[in-house]
């Protein structure tokens, strides 16, 4: 059997600030069973960006319907980009459990702001 | 075993169009984005157009956009290529492939269908 | 843009890399053409995946902005046009192909 990829397709992704960035990511396996999270950054003190469990993100929508059967796309789209929201995004694959255990990360996709044309 | 067969290539003139097909058989096609790729004579290979399982979101390379259009019937395990405003620089193999999980990647191509633009 | 050598040789037997390196993708794919015209066939997507057709002489792996296909055990059959391909769509997907010629 494969082993379990999570891909994160583009290395890096530019965007003009007021704009909206979609972040890309696939897994090759429905198995096993458990939730895609969104980071920002790396390590102890990353933040959660998207959680389609639960939680409130007003800015993020899931790119692909969630509730579709075998969906493997977890891609994200984050509107109205600040500056703020520069940094490297990390889609990460949990196995279900209590709590859930983090089997896999992406590679990471970079996001930068460019200022807004006048 | 996957088989992606490829039809109706032919020999046309600048400004006209064409319509390729290809039909697939042996996974189940509904669940696979679906992709064309295309070969001009003596060069590499070069990405069209790829559209998603459901049909409801295409990809197009600069080069043909606004002129070709990608579409499926998945009742029908088939991929379509309408070719609209044919010029001599369309003139190629144009090869059907499986989209892997992500659309950039291919696991299996078809044997290809030739088009050739001539005046 | 992906960046590939023109050509590579290798002897018969022996074993040969070919490498891909920029562009803007995180994981790349390995495609074979023996002749111009004919159908190409995958041997590598996402990195390290092989087809169940495909002999596992042929292996692919990435480090950082380079992904290497090596072929150990090189036949006189492996002779062909070999295209690396990437993950990110603003790449043109596709590199301009290294010839291997057998030896």
């Known amino acids: 059997e494969e082993e379990l990829q999570v891909i994160q397709p583009e290395k890096s992704v530019s965007v003009a600030a007021g704009d909206s960035a979609t972040l890309n990511c696939t897994v090759s396996s429905l198995i096993p069973v458990g939730p895609i999270q969104w980071f920002r950054g790396a390590g102890p003190g990353r933040e959660l960006i998207y959680n389609l469990k639960e939680g409130h993100f007003p800015r993020v929508t899931a790119v692909s319907d969630p509730t579709k059967r075998n969906n493997m796309d977890f891609s994200i789209r984050i509107s109205n980009i600040t500056p703020a929201d520069a940094g490297t995004y990390y889609c990460v694959k949990f196995r279900k459990g209590s709590p859930d255990v983090e089997l896999k990360s992406g590679a990471g996709t970079e996001l930068s702001v460019r200022a807004k044309p006048s | 075993d996957v088989q992606l067969v490829e039809s109706g290539g032919g020999v046309v003139r600048p400004g006209e169009s064409l319509r390729l097909s290809c039909e697939a058989s042996?996974?189940?096609?509904?669940?696979?984005?679906m992709t064309w790729v295309r070969q001009a004579p003596g060069e590499g290979l070069e990405w069209v157009s790829t559209i998603s399982d459901t049909g409801d979101t295409a990809y197009y390379a600069d080069s043909v956009k606004g002129r070709f259009t990608i579409s499926r019937d998945n009742s029908k395990n088939s991929l379509y290529l309408q070719m609209n405003s044919l010029r001599a620089d369309d003139t190629a193999i144009y090869y059907c492939a499986k989209s892997w999980i992500w659309w950039t990647f291919f696991d299996y191509w078809g044997l290809g269908t030739l088009v050739t633009v001539s005046s | 843009a992906l960046t590939q050598p023109a050509s590579v040789s290798a002897n018969l037997g022996g074993t040969v890399e070919i490498t891909c390196s920029g562009g803007n993708s995180n994981h790349y794919g390995w495609y074979q053409q023996k002749s111009p015209g004919s159908a190409p066939v995958t041997l590598i997507y996402a990195d390290t995946n092989r087809p169940s057709n495909i002999p596992s002489r042929f292996s692919g792996s990435t480090s950082g902005s380079t992904t290497t296909l090596t072929i150990t055990g090189v036949q006189a059959e492996d002779e062909a046009v070999y295209y690396c391909g990437g993950s990110s769509t603003g790449d043109g997907i596709f590199g301009a192909g290294t010839t291997l010629t057998v030896l």
């Open positions: 042996g996974f189940t096609f509904r669940n696979y984005y």
